[in-house]
């Protein structure tokens, strides 16, 4: 069932002060304004459900307009400990400390939280992205340097009466935004401590969080335009499936990606797209306003439900998986990048998926909820959907059990 439980304190249906508190765009991340230190220093912070450190630029960098100046904060405390976070491409490193943190367009509270002051980085900050740090909202297990470093959200829940839940509505523009438009545009909402019913339509459907590290879920079936990919469901979750607001694309394991592309190609075969398009290298363009959305299939991911042998499906449109890109050379056209890509670390349900839905990270009940977003881009013929229940057997078998090695070798 959709489990529309009675309203609880902190789960009232309206969080007006938090609505529209995100800015940005899917290609460069969504950020929230936060203040750090005393007196408060304002920074824009990337909202990332795929990591667990609160880390901010703390030294000059060519891509940063501003940075956290610890020496100006009377409440900063040095933990006398370094932190080094390597990614597959790039890295950041810094010094650990704590300070007072608040979210101006969030709950009216101030918490003392761990902060990694980034002193050196490579391929981490993005030129023109307008954010200066990252808010890792996942669990302590993947925090760096180890799971003893309490993540921000854990500190928030421990120190205040904020319920252990947050929800995200990421709003893809549906068209490319230039720099000034991004600064002026609304990117969506992060509702801390509750669910805002104005941000979605229909019902919320919940899938269990398989394990509290990343926000790991289990996909039990994949369909392209209603056609089952017919793969062993373990392949969909090899080696995990996560919900990650800090990733742009829908990323799929190699075998799944190849099968999905083959199926999407077949469904859209009325036009011949270059190989480079499917790799995310070439853009495809149409005369402004003539994008043939109808030739592209919908994609459905079936997720394990809360009840035994019950699943539900989330369906995205090409308006979500074709990402608008501005190119001066073809400015008279509407141009797009294919925003589904190959992964060697499992399925990543990034902004491409999240922009279709209001997503509830119900940590208290170890589940993630999906409902159709009130701001998703669609056309007059099709809309994103969250539907169920469906009968699906042996769903537990769809989860992949990662051999128990040291998980701290996190590579994003």
């Amino acid at each position: 069932e959709t489990d529309e439980e009675p309203e609880e304190p902190g789960r009232r249906g309206s969080f007006v002060e938090m609505v529209d508190n995100l800015r940005g765009k899917s290609g460069q991340g969504y950020y929230v304004e936060m203040t750090v230190g005393s007196p408060p220093q304002t920074l824009n912070i990337l909202v990332d459900t795929g990591s667990s450190n609160f880390a901010v630029g703390a030294a000059p960098h060519p891509f940063l307009h501003r940075y956290y100046q610890r020496q100006l904060s009377s409440t900063y405390r040095d933990l006398r400990k370094g932190v080094y976070v390597p990614y597959t491409q790039g890295k950041w490193e810094g010094e650990l400390g704590t300070d007072l943190v608040s979210i101006p367009h969030g709950p009216n509270v101030t918490v003392r939280a761990n902060i990694a002051a980034i002193t050196e980085s490579d391929k981490f900050f993005i030129n023109g992205s307008n954010w200066e740090g990252i808010l890792g909202l996942a669990y302590a297990e993947i925090a760096r340097p180890d799971d003893s470093l309490e993540p921000f959200f854990d500190s928030l829940v421990k120190q205040t009466h904020v319920p252990n839940l947050f929800s995200l509505q990421l709003c893809g523009a549906g068209f490319p935004l230039n720099q000034s438009e991004v600064l002026a545009s609304v990117g969506g909402s992060m509702i801390i401590g509750g669910i805002d019913h104005s941000l979605y339509t229909g019902s919320l459907w919940y899938t269990p969080i398989r394990r509290e590290w990343y926000y790991e879920v289990i996909i039990v079936r994949v369909e392209i335009n209603g056609q089952d990919l017919k793969m062993d469901c373990k392949e969909y979750n090899y080696d995990k499936s996560i919900v990650d607001s800090g990733t742009t694309n829908l990323r799929l394991p190699k075998k799944v990606f190849e099968a999905a592309v083959k199926s999407i190609k077949a469904a859209s075969s009325t036009e011949k797209f270059p190989d480079g398009f499917w790799l995310g290298e070439q853009l495809v363009c149409w005369q402004a306003g003539t994008t043939p959305w109808n030739i592209f299939p919908v994609i459905s991911l079936y997720l394990m439900g809360e009840v035994t042998n019950q699943s539900f499906r989330i369906t995205i449109l090409p308006q979500q998986y074709l990402r608008p890109v501005e190119d001066v050379a073809t400015s008279q056209d509407d141009c797009y990048k294919f925003a589904i890509s190959q992964s060697s670390t499992g399925t990543v349900m990034g902004a491409v998926i999240m922009e279709g839905f209001y997503v509830v990270f119900d940590r208290a009940r170890k589940r993630i909820g999906f409902a159709v977003s009130a701001c998703h881009v669609h056309d007059e013929f099709r809309t994103a959907a969250v539907e169920g229940p469906f009968v699906t057997l042996d769903m537990e078998d769809c989860g992949y059990n990662i051999p128990q090695t040291d998980e701290s070798t996190l590579m994003t």
């Epitope: 993005i126 011949k272 797209f273 270059p274 190119d327």
Partner: antibody, heavy 116, light 107 residues
Framework: EVQLQQSGPELVKPGASVKLSCKAS?????NFWIHWLKQRPGQGLEW???????????KYNQKFKAKATLTVDTSSSTTYMHLSSLTSEDSAVYYC?????????WGQRTLVTVSA | DIVMTQSQKFMSTSVGDRVSVTCKAS??????VAWYQQKPGQSPKALIY???HRYSGVPDRFTGSGSGTDFTLTISNVQSEDLAEYFC?????????FGGGTKLEIK
């Protein structure tokens, strides 16, 4: 304005190696792949390979796989091509080009001369 | 690899004339063809994409046509500054390949 600024001409000895650079400006660097091409008189344009600045993923023309190595530095919006074990066959004009639909933008050319 | 053949290596034309440069692909490439202009000592300049779409800023005397295997670049009302070599390119599949070029000479 989109610009691809290539490094200057190179005169190198046979057997040596060389690293060419291509600095991009005027657009979001990680949004578009960078390609490298070779042009010799009377032999037309040859595609060497390409790199995705967002994650350094590369794809090469099989012919150049042992010859060329593409790398990227996002902090300076610069792409590099390293050419190894140079012979007279590698004497050519080299271009970087930015993807989009086909190659809408090209660097201004780098002449490599391999000579003893 | 897909071979792109420009059978005419040279073409002669006069200012004000209309000239057509042709290109043939060894297999179906849909409309995934681009045309470039290269003047002596310069880099190629992109003219046409998707067989018939002009890049921003390209004069409308340049038009492209064709699909499948046969493609044409037409320059109407040829100007003296059009003296250059013209290349076709298929970007339908890797490896990306180019035609051998057609040099346009102004009489």
């Amino acid at each position: 304005e989109v610009q691809l600024q290539q490094s200057g001409p190179e005169l190198v000895k046979p057997g040596a190696s060389v690293k060419l650079s291509c600095k991009a400006s005027g657009y979001t660097f990680t949004n578009f792949w960078i390609h490298w091409l070779k042009q010799r008189p009377g032999q037309g344009l040859e595609w060497i390979g390409m790199i995705d600045p967002s994650d350094s993923y590369t794809k090469y023309n099989q012919k150049f796989k042992a010859k060329a190595t593409l790398t990227v530095d996002t902090s300076s919006s610069t792409t590099y091509m390293h050419l190894s074990s140079l012979t007279s066959e590698d004497s050519a004009v080299y271009y970087c080009a930015r993807s989009g639909v086909a190659f809408p933008y090209w660097g201004q050319r780098t002449l490599v001369t391999v000579s003893a | 690899d897909i071979v792109m053949t420009q059978s005419q290596k040279f073409m002669s034309t006069s200012v004000g004339d209309r000239v057509s440069v042709t290109c043939k692909a060894s297999q179906n490439v849909g409309t995934n063809v681009a045309w470039y202009q290269q003047k002596p000592g310069q880099s190629p300049k992109a003219l046409i994409y998707s067989a018939s779409h002009r890049y921003s800023g390209v004069p409308d005397r340049f038009t492209g046509s064709g699909s499948g295997t046969d493609f044409t670049l037409t320059i109407s009302n040829v100007q003296s500054e059009d003296l250059a070599e013209y290349f076709c390119q298929q970007y339908n599949s890797y490896m990306y390949t180019f035609g051998g070029g057609t040099k346009l000479e102004i009489k």
